[in-house]
Interface confidence: low
């Protein structure tokens, strides 16, 4: 249906306050660096604009494309240049290819510092003195570090975060209220952020195909009572929703996200018993509860998969005259009979099943060359659940730091090109699926774990991407979405690297050491790690435990001397010294 | 714009109080939350009140709680600091600070518009 007015449409669609949440998070994930008051003023005359075309749909300005309008304002801002450098020439493009080149701009790792939040009692004045500018403000910086997170989700935290203040800012101890459920909700933004930009990535590289495969089978897992035209039509919808918020258009995929939890809702009978309770919440909750919804049991009726992919004559007819619907429905079919399997591991054995057909359908006789094909699944199988075998048993044996720089360990040898900062930032990240994942019972381990080390392994192609250094990194990051993991568990030593040169001041300490929180100590110590590493790529695992091993008595002698900073810089030297000669 | 100008400061006894006032011309002042900063010789600028734009809302730095209050009077466009029970530690230039989109209230970077400074000095 056609508007006389888009943004009329989406500002009467979403109503004001969402509206304004999503302008205000779409211009801080286009201009990362502006100050939240600019960002403030922008979203206030967009949100203005927008009433005033929903008065009057023929007003001045008010039928042209969103992307127009939100390119006109961008291009308004006066430090465009001077902040931006090379951005600015984006404005003298059209549209669409100016919108294209605001989205090839957004920095997946803007280097802004981590967000520290002042104390309980500052957090709680502001929030109860203007709540909207506190909510504005938390929009603001979280979208400006995640310039690709799901915006109708940001929205829900923020709601979320909201809901955690009117709580605790009345407890008797607010600090100890905020702390952990701030805590909490953190861990959780994070995890989104970068589900998104997996998505995101899936989209933007592997195409709308890759999405499609990775929904169908992910959703044919969580409603295995739903038909496959179900399914089809509720991935289909996702990937519009996606496309929208990976593309910068926030409105439309909010609205449409809306649209789809609507749907879904009118529709449960024929997709989940487990949509109830979702569905009589509010729009925002009410579409983060089915995102979360717990998997449907399995009908008790499936017949086997045999039947329809192996053993019905037909299958080479089945498959040629339409293949994407054919393949879909085995990805559907396994899928929904697998709910312990990854999705990774899912794409792979329909992609295993689609190079059998091509091969087989080609021959004399492809009943008997395919005969065997559910069989030969068998080795991609057990990879994946061998691999989070060993991984847990290694996990539970040295915990989650000891994991974290085994590693570091091991992603440093086989990509000692890498920057230290992403290999400290993706090895703690890979670490974290062992909290994460171990404890879950064997049949939800393999999922878990898997589907976890894909999102963060794209956190690695992403920034990877931006600098390319190694021809390795690109290969495995590039070739195929679903054999990213495998393709890095595979990488051996880097035998071509040429080891750095040493540098004294890498492996100099302050007495600031000591007063970092654990988690910044632990960065600190694993960055040591890396670079000795890239000094001596050649060093045991045997030589870098008593390294490190060292290293952790001398932060610890240092930090409880009397003169630290002393210490610091008279032990230091020693301590090198005698790492270089463990390391020969 | 908005000009903000200090006065109130001078010399008192440790024990003593003095009461500090910030006006503010060129604009009303009910849109911004006020906050007093100081920097004391050879050390960083730091946090020491503020009050959100209704007067609702006030908050200290730990080291002045309890013996400092601000208070404001959007009528007269003047943000106040009380100063109760001084201290030799409390010797320091204090500076009004404005801050239009402030949210949290204790980073300087908030504040969008400041003072020139009035000096306080605690000594017997």
């Known amino acids: 249906e056609a508007y006389k007015s888009e943004i009329a449409h989406r500002y009467n669609d979403l109503g004001e306050e969402h509206f304004r949440g999503l302008v205000l998070v779409a211009f801080s994930q286009y201009l990362q660096q502006c100050p939240f008051e600019d960002h403030v003023k922008l979203a206030k005359e967009v949100t203005e604009f927008a009433k005033a075309c929903a008065a009057e749909e023929s007003g001045a300005n008010c039928d042209k494309s969103l992307h127009t309008l939100f390119g006109d304002k961008l291009c308004t801002v006066a430090s465009l240049r001077d902040k931006y450098g090379d951005m600015a020439d984006c404005c003298e493009k059209q549209e669409p290819d100016r919108n294209e080149c605001f989205l090839a701009h957004k920095d997946d790792n803007p280097g802004f510092p981590p967000l520290v939040a002042p104390e309980p009692d500052a957090l709680c004045a502001a929030f109860q003195d203007n709540e909207q500018l506190f909510l504005g403000k938390y929009l603001y910086e979280i979208a400006r570090r995640h310039p690709y997170f799901y915006a109708p989700e940001l929205l829900y935290y923020a709601q979320q975060y909201k809901g955690v203040f009117a709580e605790c800012c009345q407890a008797a101890d607010k600090a100890a209220c905020l702390g952990p459920k701030i805590e909490a909700l953190r861990e959780k933004v994070l995890l989104s952020s970068a589900k998104e930009r997996f998505k995101c990535a899936s989209l933007q590289k592997f195409g709308d195909r890759a999405f499609k495969a990775w929904s169908v089978a992910r959703l044919s897992q969580r409603f295995p009572k739903a038909d496959f035209a179900e399914i089809s039509k509720v991935v289909t919808d996702l990937t519009k929703v996606h496309k929208e918020c990976c593309h910068g258009d926030l409105l439309e995929c909010a609205d449409d996200r809306a649209d789809l939890a609507k749907y879904m809702c009118e529709n449960q009978d024929s997709i989940s018993t487990k949509l109830k309770e979702c569905c009589d919440k509010p729009v925002l909750e009410k579409s983060q509860c089915l995102a979360e919804v717990e998997r449907d049991e399995l009908p008790g009726d499936l017949p086997s998969l045999a039947a329809d992919f192996v053993e019905d004559k037909e299958v080479c007819k089945n498959y040629q005259e339409a293949k994407d619907v054919f393949l879909g429905t085995f990805l559907y079919e396994y899928a929904r009979r697998h709910p312990e399997y990854s999705v990774s591991l899912l794409l792979r054995l329909a992609k295993e099943y689609e190079a059998t057909l091509e091969k087989c359908c080609a021959t004399d006789d492809p009943p008997t060359c395919y005969a065997k094909v559910l069989d030969e699944f068998k080795p991609l199988v057990d990879e994946p659940q061998n691999l989070v075998k060993t991984n847990c048993e290694l996990f539970e044996k040295l915990g989650e730091y000891g994991f974290q720089n085994a590693l570091l360990v091991r992603y440093t040898k086989k990509a000692p090109q890498v920057s230290t900062p992403t290999l400290v930032e993706v090895s703690r990240k890979l670490g974290k699926v062992g909290t994460k994942c171990c404890k879950k019972p064997e049949s939800e381990r393999m999922s878990c774990a898997e589907d976890f080390l894909s999102v963060v392994l794209n956190r690695l192609c992403v920034l990877h991407e931006k600098t390319p250094v190694s021809e390795r990194v690109t290969k495995c990051c590039s070739e195929s979405l679903v054999n990213r993991r495998p393709c890095f568990s595979g990488l051996e030593v880097d035998e071509t690297y040429v080891p750095k040169e040493f540098n004294a001041e890498t492996f100099t300490f302050h007495a600031d050491l000591c007063t970092l929180p654990e988690a910044e100590k632990q960065v600190k110590k694993q960055t040591a790690l890396v670079e000795l590493l890239k000094h001596k790529p050649k060093a045991t695992d045997e030589q870098l435990k008593t390294v490190m091993g060292d290293f952790g008595a001398f932060v610890e002698k240092c930090c409880a001397a009397e003169n630290k900073e002393g210490c610091f810089s008279e032990e230091g030297p020693k301590l090198v010294a005698a790492a270089q000669a463990a390391l020969v | 714009e908005v000009q903000l100008v200090e006065s109130g400061g001078g010399v008192v006894q440790p024990g003593g109080s003095l009461r500090l006032s910030c006006a503010a011309s060129g604009s009303t002042i009910s849109s911004y939350v006020m906050g007093w900063f100081r920097r004391a010789p050879g050390k960083e600028r730091e946090f020491v009140a503020a009050?959100?734009?209704?007067?609702?809302?006030?908050y200290y730095a730990d080291s002045v709680k309890g013996r400092f209050t601000i208070s404001r009077d959007n009528s007269k466009k003047t943000a106040y600091l009380q100063m109760n029970s001084l201290r030799p530690e409390d010797t320091a230039l204090y500076y009004c600070a404005a801050g239009r989109y402030s949210a949290w209230y204790s980073q300087s970077y908030e504040y969008d518009y400041w003072g020139q400074g009035t000096l306080v000095t605690v000594s017997s």
């Open positions: 009050i959100s734009r209704s007067g609702g809302y006030t």
